[in-house]
Interface confidence: low
C-alpha cells in the first residue's frame, strides 16, 4: 500500500537568464528511494539520481542543469522555452512509483515572484 505523499515547489516563476531549483520531497513513507527521475514537459529526461550510482545529467541538458541540492535539480540560464511542467518520479521499494508536478514560468520581466527558498541569486 502506497502511504507516501510528494510535496513539490508547486507553481514557481523565475527570470529569464536566471536559475531556479526544482524540489520534490517524499514524506509519510518508510519506503527506500532507489531512483529519482526528473522529466521536462515533453517527457524528455533531464536527469536521474540513482541511490547507489549517483547522478546522471542527460547530454542535451548538461550545460544548463546541475544536480541538487539533495534530490532536487537546479536549472540555469533559463530561457522562455523552459516554461512548462516538470515532473519528479520517485522509484521506491516496496511502495512503487510516486510522481510530483512542478510548473515553471520563465518571465521576461526583471521582477519574478517566487519563493526565495527555491531561488538562486
Amino acid at each position: 500500500m502506497m502511504t507516501g505523499t510528494i510535496e513539490t515547489t508547486g507553481n514557481i516563476s523565475a527570470k529569464k537568464g536566471g536559475s531556479v531549483i526544482l524540489q520534490c520531497h517524499l514524506s509519510s513513507t518508510m519506503a527506500q528511494v532507489t531512483q529519482v527521475n526528473w522529466e521536462q514537459h515533453d517527457h524528455s529526461l533531464l536527469a536521474i539520481r540513482n541511490a547507489e550510482l549517483g547522478w546522471h545529467i542527460y547530454p542535451a541538458f548538461k550545460d544548463r542543469v546541475a544536480p541538487g541540492p539533495g534530490l532536487g535539480l537546479t536549472l540555469q540560464s533559463l530561457t522562455m522555452n523552459d516554461t512548462g511542467e516538470y515532473f519528479c518520479t520517485y522509484h521506491t521499494y516496496p511502495d512503487g512509483t510516486y510522481r510530483g508536478r512542478i510548473f515553471l514560468e520563465v518571465l521576461e520581466s526583471s521582477v519574478a515572484e517566487h519563493s526565495a527558498r527555491f531561488q538562486i541569486p
Epitope: 531512483q35 527521475n37 524528455s44 536521474i48 550510482l53 549517483g54 546522471h56 522509484h91
Partner: antibody, heavy 119, light 107 residues
Framework: QVQLQQPGPELVKPGASVKISCKAS????????MNWVKQSNGKSLEWIGV????????NYNQKFKGKATLTVDQSSSTAYMQLNSLTSEDSAVYFC????????????WGQGTTLTVSS | DIVMTQSPASLSASVGETVTITCRAS??????LAWYQQKQGKSPQLLVF???TLTEGVPSRFSGSGSGTQFSLKINSLQPEDFGSYYC?????????FGGGTKLEIK
C-alpha cells in the same frame, strides 16, 4: 577512438568458473560505467549488470545475481566479469558495453567473447 | 521488469524501400528508448537514444519516434549496409531490457 577489447572464445567445463576481461582505451575509464550483456545463440540481448569503475559500485539484473560478479582494475582500465557454477545455459556471447550513466544506453561495445560450456 | 515487445520479428525489403520497426513497452517509459543495429557476428551499435536522438555518425535516413509505450524506428531509402538485426532497449530504470529483435533481410 573508444575501444573495448575482449578475449577470444572460451571453452570451460560444467561447474567451473570463468573470468572475462574487457580492456578499455580511448577515454577516461572512470568517467563511464561498464555494463555486461549476454546474447544466447544469436538471439536477443540480456543486461547482466553494471559497475561504476570510479567507486566499484555495482548493480545486477536479479536473474544474474549469484551467477555474475563484476569487478574493475583502474590501473589497467580493465573491467572483469566472473561467471561461476557454469552450465550449458551459460553458453553465449558476452559483451562489455560502455554505459552512458550507469547503464541507460550503451554507446560503445566490445567485440564479444563466446563462452562454450561443455564437458 | 519492463517488457519490450518488438515487431515484426523479421521482414524482407529491397534496397531503396522504406521500412518501419515498432517497439512497445509494458509500461510508460516516456522517451527513454534506444535502438541498436547488429550485423551478423558483430557487436550491436547504438543508433538512437532518448527515442529520437541520432547518435553521431548515424545517417539521417534513420529516424526514431514515439513516447510513452509506443515507439518506432524508420529507415528511409534502405541501403545494402542497413541489413541486419535491430533491437530496442528501454533506458528508464534498471533492469534495462531489450526487445526480441527484428531481422531485416534483403528481398
Amino acid at each position: 577512438q573508444v575501444q573495448l577489447q575482449q578475449p577470444g572464445p572460451e571453452l570451460v567445463k560444467p561447474g567451473a568458473s570463468v573470468k572475462i576481461s574487457c580492456k578499455a582505451s580511448g577515454y577516461s575509464f572512470t568517467d563511464y560505467n561498464m555494463n555486461w550483456v549476454k546474447q544466447s545463440n544469436g538471439k536477443s540481448l540480456e543486461w547482466i549488470g553494471v559497475i561504476n569503475p570510479n567507486s566499484g559500485t555495482d548493480n545486477y539484473n536479479q536473474k544474474f545475481k549469484g551467477k555474475a560478479t563484476l569487478t574493475v582494475d583502474q590501473s589497467s582500465s580493465t573491467a572483469y566479469m566472473q561467471l561461476n557454477s557454469l552450465t550449458s545455459e551459460d553458453s553465449a556471447v558476452y559483451f562489455c558495453a560502455r554505459g552512458v550513466y550507469f547503464g541507460n544506453y550503451f554507446d560503445s561495445w566490445g567485440q564479444g567473447t563466446t563462452l562454450t560450456v561443455s564437458s | 521488469d519492463i517488457v519490450m515487445t518488438q515487431s515484426p520479428a523479421s521482414l524482407s525489403a529491397s534496397v531503396g524501400e522504406t521500412v518501419t520497426i515498432t517497439c512497445r513497452a509494458s509500461e510508460n517509459i516516456y522517451s527513454s528508448l534506444a535502438w541498436y543495429q547488429q550485423k551478423q557476428g558483430k557487436s550491436p551499435q547504438l543508433l538512437v537514444f532518448n527515442a529520437k536522438t541520432l547518435t553521431e555518425g548515424v545517417p539521417s535516413r534513420f529516424s526514431g519516434s514515439g513516447s510513452g509505450t509506443q515507439f518506432s524506428l524508420k529507415i528511409n531509402s534502405l541501403q545494402p549496409e542497413d541489413f541486419g538485426s535491430y533491437y530496442c532497449q528501454h533506458h528508464y530504470g534498471a533492469p534495462w531490457t531489450f526487445g526480441g529483435g527484428t531481422k531485416l533481410e534483403i528481398k
